[in-house]
Each structure stands twice: as structure tokens, then as C-alpha cells.
């Protein structure tokens, strides 16, 4: 059985303030069943950025339809970027359970924010 891979192809992304940022993430397998969540930061203090199941994420949308059968693209778009959004973002696969169990993280994508061109 091939090991699940969580692929974040870009090590870094630079976006002008006010623009949208797309953070790409794909998984190599539909198995095991379980959600993908996005976080900023890697330690215990990491911030939840997007969780399809529940939560309040007004500036974050899924690029593909995550409810679509056989979807393996879990990229997100963050709108109206500000300097406070800078940081390293991780796409993380969980195994469905009670609670869900963290399986594998992507390598992370560092988001940097440029000043808005005048």
C-alpha cells in the first residue's frame, strides 16, 4: 500500500497586500477517509485557518469543491491579504475518528506580504 503524501508544491508565495493568496495542496490518495485542515504554524500554538466540516473562516474558500467525490485537491484561497497574514501555512490530513487523528502534514508554504503598489 502506497504511503499517503500531502503535497504543498510551493515552498513560498509572495502576495501584495489587498490581493488574494492561493495556497496549493493535493493528496496522493483518497485513503484513509478523513478531513484535511489548514493551519498557520506548526507547533501546539498553531492557528486553524480552514476546516471544511465546521467553523468560521470568512476570508478563506476552497479552490476546488471539497465535497466532490474523489476530490484530491484541497487548495485554499485567502482574500484581502494583510501583513498580519504572513506566516507558514500547513495542509494537514486527518484520519476520521472520535476525535480525528492527525496523519500527515505537508511541508508548509511560507506566505509573505508585499506592500501594496502605489
Amino acid at each position: 500500500e502506497e504511503e499517503l503524501q500531502v503535497i504543498q508544491p510551493e515552498k513560498s508565495v509572495s502576495v501584495a497586500a489587498g490581493d488574494s493568496a492561493t495556497l496549493n495542496c493535493t493528496v496522493s490518495s483518497l485513503i484513509p477517509v478523513g478531513p484535511i485542515q489548514w493551519f498557520r504554524g506548526a507547533g501546539p500554538g498553531r492557528e486553524l485557518i480552514y476546516n471544511l466540516k465546521e467553523g468560521h473562516f470568512p476570508r478563506v474558500t476552497a479552490v476546488s469543491d471539497p465535497t466532490k467525490r474523489n476530490n484530491m485537491d484541497f487548495s485554499i484561497r485567502i482574500s484581502n491579504i494583510t501583513p498580519a497574514d504572513a506566516g507558514t501555512y500547513y495542509c494537514v490530513k486527518f484520519r476520521k475518528g472520535s476525535p480525528d487523528v492527525e496523519l500527515k502534514s505537508g511541508a508548509g508554504t511560507e506566505l509573505s506580504v508585499r506592500a501594496k503598489p502605489s
Epitope: F39, G41, G43, P44, G45, R46, E47, L48, I49, G87
Partner: antibody, heavy 117, light 108 residues
């Protein structure tokens, strides 16, 4: 505006229990790790415990096995159950919001716990 | 556990003078060091993070520097409202998150 309001402090005898609460508002509580930090009279702050956004818990060695941190995202409330209290647990207990890079960016006003026989 | 040692214990200066506070870590923390200000009866307030980045709303008279094990908080021109205790904190990814013992800044 972010607000954190602790409650539940008081005077107890050694060996007794207390449960602290922290009501949060002004931010999406479920998206952030939360922590308890205490400060004994005249001393510096001491990190006590943390609960992550996925409800994983972490404790300082000094409270491990005696204190339990938990969160109720539906109520935007953080808790600290403190059992087998000791005189050295006497302190002001603050709850704080943690940023993604492990900074304590907002603190409550604190609640005083006094353990004395 | 990383131990943070602050010096001096107390600093007594006049308004307009420059205050230099030191924090030394028992092992390297890279640039992951923060400074907090605490006034009597209040909770600590974040001033500086990542050694030299000012937190939102913090006046530019506060600046931080250093990396590895040796860090400095500088208040370029002391004002009366800067009278407080200042704590350093290492903010590497994993607990325990440790604080220094503090430096008390008194305004003469």
C-alpha cells in the same frame, strides 16, 4: 475587541480543588490555541498549560497529573480543573490567547487562587 | 527547559534617558524571543516578538535586538508611563514556554 474574563478563583486548603473558567469574546475562539499562565506574588509569569485547536493538551511539569485544561468551543470558554492544590500553586491565574507563532497576544485580568491551611 | 536570565534586576533612570535591558537564554532560541511589559495590577502586554518586531500599537521608542542566546530590549527615551516590570519569553514551537525573572524599570 478581544476580551478574556477569568473566574473561579478563591481561597482553598491544601489538597482541595478549584475550577477556573475563562470566557472569551471578540475573536473566533475555536481557531486559536489557548493557555493558562500563572504569576505568584512578586514573581515572573509561569506557563501552566495549553490546549491546541485540535484539543491536544500540554502541561508544565509542576502541574502534570493534577491540573486538567479543556475548552468548550460552543461556549467560547476555556477551563482549568485544579486538583490536589498545594501552597506553591498560590498565584494569579491568567488565561491568554496564543498566536500561531506562540506569542501570548491577549491576556485576561486574572483570577487569584490562594492555597492556605 | 530553556532558562532565561534577565539583568539588571532593577534599573532606575530619569525621563529621557536610554534604558538597556538584557535577557540571556541557557540555550539558543534563534530569534524566537519576545518582551512583555507589566504594570502593577495589570496583565503582561506583548511589546516585541521575533527578537526585534514591534507588536501592534507599540511606540517606536521600544526596540529589540539579538539572536541565539543574548537579547536586548532598548527604550530609547524613557517616559514616565514606561515605569513597569519587563519580562522576556522564548517562543519556540514547543512548551514549556519560559519567561525570565524580570527587570523593574523605575523612573526617578
Amino acid at each position: 475587541d478581544v476580551q478574556l474574563v477569568e473566574s473561579g478563583g478563591g481561597v482553598v486548603r491544601p489538597g482541595e480543588s478549584l475550577r477556573l473558567s475563562c470566557a472569551a469574546s471578540g475573536f473566533t475562539f475555536s481557531n486559536f490555541a489557548m493557555t493558562w499562565v500563572r504569576q505568584a506574588p512578586g514573581k515572573g509569569p509561569e506557563w501552566v498549560s495549553l490546549v491546541s485547536v485540535t484539543a491536544t493538551t500540554y502541561y508544565a511539569d509542576s502541574v502534570k497529573g493534577r491540573f486538567t485544561i479543556s475548552r468548550d468551543n460552543s461556549k467560547s470558554t476555556l477551563y482549568l480543573q485544579m486538583n490536589s492544590l498545594r501552597a506553591e500553586d498560590t498565584a494569579v491565574y491568567y488565561c491568554a490567547k496564543i498566536t500561531w507563532n506562540n506569542l501570548f497576544d491577549y491576556w485576561g485580568l486574572g483570577t487569584l487562587v490562594t492555597v492556605s491551611s | 527547559e530553556i532558562v532565561l536570565t534577565q539583568s539588571p534586576g532593577t534599573l532606575s533612570l530619569s525621563p529621557g534617558e536610554r534604558a538597556t535591558l538584557s535577557c540571556r537564554a541557557s540555550q539558543t532560541v534563534g530569534s524566537k524571543l519576545a518582551w512583555y511589559q507589566q504594570k502593577p495590577g495589570q496583565a503582561p502586554r506583548l511589546l516585541i516578538y521575533d527578537s526585534s518586531s514591534r507588536a501592534s500599537g507599540i511606540p517606536d521608542r521600544f526596540s529589540g535586538s539579538g539572536s541565539g542566546t543574548d537579547f536586548t530590549l532598548t527604550i530609547s527615551s524613557l517616559q514616565s508611563e514606561d515605569s513597569a516590570v519587563y519580562y522576556c519569553q522564548q517562543h519556540n514551537d514547543w512548551p514549556p514556554y519560559t519567561f525570565g525573572g524580570g527587570t523593574k524599570v523605575e523612573i526617578k
